[in-house]
Interface confidence: low
């Protein structure tokens, strides 16, 4: 199994960024971290979504991976999509220094987010609890802004 | 490649304050990884550690514990330059003070870590005396 990960984040746009993944054992959580810059200061969602299809720029990507047919919810949440990872933050200067450790995506198995699509979204992840519809799929966090497919790293 | 070079070591007695200065130059703009800048000490006989790093393309802070209150890092990005504040000195705090740039995200457990940093400055002593 991969152990590593990376994604490079592109959008239309001046937001792009690295995003890594480790996981040291299977059955064990992965940590993220990296950065993204080129944002607007405060939360936006950060998801890993179905396809890594990047033909139409993000928007092929489909939507959040949600291989257990659950609603959208928080990281924490048991609630939840595999794909929700939440919301990074960006600082004044437009870059969000994200460290996440998630215990619900892998990096094999059956919740692998290897090949599928990283997106960082225009707005903050309401975490479904926005009390409509739309939050119950996507956390009303709006367009993408950036995003990339995960792929194995050395 | 950047280079780095810091200043403002010299000798002072405990529970007294010093400013460092790292100045980084040269090296290319990386299109999506912003470097990590960071102050290490050796002090004779003993191994290398990290004691503050920064991320230079935003505003995170990481502290090692035996600094943690007392030590503060922060960066001016126009002139380059990461500074240490170190107040409330102490004899252990004793050593030969580097700084160093990585120029990758850095997973958390390892920001302090020399093992990350790839760029290193030619180092500035700090005596503190009882």
């Known amino acids: 199994m991969a152990t590593k990960a990376v994604c490079v984040l592109k959008g239309d746009g001046p937001v792009q960024g690295i995003i890594n993944f480790e996981q040291k054992e299977s059955n064990g959580p992965v940590k993220v971290w990296g950065s993204i810059k080129g944002l607007t200061e405060g939360l936006h969602g950060f998801h890993v979504h179905e396809f890594g299809d990047n033909t139409a720029g993000c928007t092929s990507a489909g939507p959040h991976f949600n291989p257990l047919s659950r609603k959208h919810g928080g990281p924490k949440d048991e609630e939840r999509h595999v794909g929700d990872l939440g919301n990074v933050t960006a600082d004044k200067d437009g870059v969000a220094d994200v460290s996440i450790e998630d215990s619900v995506i892998s990096l094999s198995g059956d919740h692998c987010i290897i090949g599928r699509t990283l997106v960082v979204h225009e707005k903050a992840d309401d975490l479904g609890k926005g009390g409509n519809e739309e939050s119950t799929k996507t956390g009303n966090a709006g367009s993408r802004l950036a995003c990339g497919v995960i792929g194995i790293a050395q | 490649q950047v280079q780095l070079q810091e200043s403002g070591g010299g000798s002072v007695q405990a529970g007294g304050s010093l400013r460092l200065a790292c100045v980084a130059s040269?090296?290319?703009?990386?299109?999506?990884?912003?470097?990590?800048m960071g102050w290490y000490r050796q002090a004779p006989g003993k191994e290398r550690e990290g004691v503050a790093t920064?991320?230079?393309?935003?505003?995170?802070?990481y502290y090692s514990d035996s600094v943690e209150g007392r030590f503060t890092i922060s960066q001016d990005k126009a002139q380059r330059t990461v500074y240490l504040q170190m107040n409330d000195l102490k004899p252990e705090d004793t050593g030969m003070y580097y700084c160093?740039?990585?120029?990758?995200?850095?997973?958390?457990?390892?920001?302090?870590?020399?093992?990350?940093?790839?760029?290193w400055g030619p180092g500035t002593q700090v005596t503190v005396s009882s």
């Open positions: 160093a740039a990585g120029n990758g995200a850095l997973p958390p457990g390892r920001r302090l870590s020399p093992q990350n940093m790839d760029t």
């Open positions: 040269g090296g290319d703009t990386r299109p999506y990884i912003t470097y990590w």
């Open positions: 920064i991320y230079t393309g935003g505003s995170g802070t």
